[in-house]
């Protein structure tokens, strides 16, 4: 097992879950390390603790290893990190990489309010409720940034939108999540659609930084707390 | 499905040495990667050793060159020879498997495992 030493270490190795961070109850998972190419140890740790390792033989590429997970339960939901061995130094810790296990217990609605097709600077908000009591909910623009609104609720959420742009177009689900980590099914996907004339740029989204409280959830965050932009569904972790 | 079967503990003294068996029921052996736990009594389950489907070995510092761990593809078997035993060796060990698994996979954690045996009882007494 890994032992801390701060003097001397190895770069951080990337993390990353293929297919995705958002896993279904039952399904597999692919967690990626990519170290060096000189490592002879790789490490996986899940919540603190040592999960699974894996010695690269000579003959494949050493600079990155695959971990799997056969069947995600809420017990391998959270937050993953690895480290790399090379002679006889470890690497610094990975970003953490947080893994959601979806599809349990329940399915919740989602609605949008005043409708799905709204005109250009309406105002707009989207309704999750979910029949078993939870803690917070969650809504996801499906294909599109990695902002991820929550909001805490007994069995029904709000998430007011403001004015909507060209931007708020697009496909939303919403889960209720059981812990940050365990979440429901997703809802029937909504669809939004905005009709009107050309965009007014004092209708422009709102700064995310002065929303924190809706974007606040992050399964992979930099500095500000914020999502960092890149595909949802095949997400990476670094730097 | 996969089922596990433990057998070989018993009741043995201090110094003494055991080979626990676990027998996989079930085709998808030889892509599994398999574990040895341990419960001592009002204790957690603890991580003893794991053997990748390549043969790759880890172990608890607690029984590090004292227990060995090892495979037979072609009898659906794992093997746990325990020498050097101690009192503190005393618990129910059971077998795991993780399967499917990939390449050369070692897993620590309980979590990873998704079939487990029934147990079987090791007493190490005078």
């Known amino acids: 097992q890994r032992i801390n030493t701060e003097k001397e270490t190895l770069p951080k190795p990337i993390i990353w879950a293929k297919p995705s961070i958002m896993v279904t109850n039952g399904n597999s998972v692919n967690i990626w390390c990519q170290g060096a190419q000189s490592a002879s140890e790789y490490q996986l740790y899940f919540e603190g603790s040592f999960f699974a390792l894996e010695r690269p033989k000579p003959s494949r590429s050493m600079n990155k290893v695959r971990f799997f997970i056969s069947q995600m339960t809420s017990h391998t939901a959270g937050i993953y990190t690895c480290f790399y061995q090379s002679g006889e130094l470890w690497s610094k810790s990975s970003n953490p990489l947080k893994l959601v296990v979806t599809g349990l217990y329940d399915t919740p609605n989602l609605w949008v309010y005043p409708r799905p097709e709204v005109t250009l600077g309406e105002n707009v908000t989207f309704f999750c409720q979910l029949k078993t009591a939870t803690s917070k909910f969650f809504l996801l623009k499906e294909r599109g940034s990695n902002h991820i609104q929550n909001k805490y609720g007994n069995i029904q959420a709000e998430f007011p939108m403001g004015p909507v742009t060209r931007a708020h177009r697009g496909t939303y689900r919403c889960f209720g999540s059981y812990n940050d980590y365990a979440w429901s099914f997703p809802s029937e996907p909504v669809t939004l659609l905005i009709t009107g004339g050309v965009e007014n740029s004092s209708l422009a989204p709102t700064d995310p930084t002065s929303s924190l409280d809706y974007w606040e959830f992050d399964l992979s965050t930099n500095e500000s707390g914020l999502q960092k932009d890149s595909a949802f569904w095949d997400h990476t972790t670094q730097n | 499905e996969v089922q596990l079967v433990e057998s070989g503990g018993g009741e043995v003294q201090p110094g003494g040495s055991l080979r626990l068996s676990c027998a996989a029921s079930?085709?998808?052996?030889?892509?599994?990667?398999m574990g040895w736990f341990r419960q001592a009594p009002g204790k957690e389950r603890e991580f003893v050793a794991a053997?990748?489907?390549?043969?790759?070995?880890y172990y608890a510092e607690s029984v590090k060159g004292r227990f060995t761990i090892s495979r037979d593809n072609a009898k659906n078997t794992v093997y746990l020879q325990m020498s050097s035993l101690r009192a503190e060796d005393t618990a129910v060990y059971y077998c795991?498997?993780?399967?499917?698994?990939?390449?050369?996979?070692?897993?620590?954690?309980?979590?990873?495992?998704?079939?487990w045996g029934q147990g079987t009882l090791v007493t190490v007494k005078p």
């Open positions: 795991a498997a993780v399967v499917p698994t990939y390449g050369n996979n070692i897993y620590v954690h309980s979590a990873a495992y998704n079939y």
């Open positions: 079930g085709r998808t052996f030889a892509s599994a990667a």
């Open positions: 053997i990748s489907r390549s043969d790759d070995t």
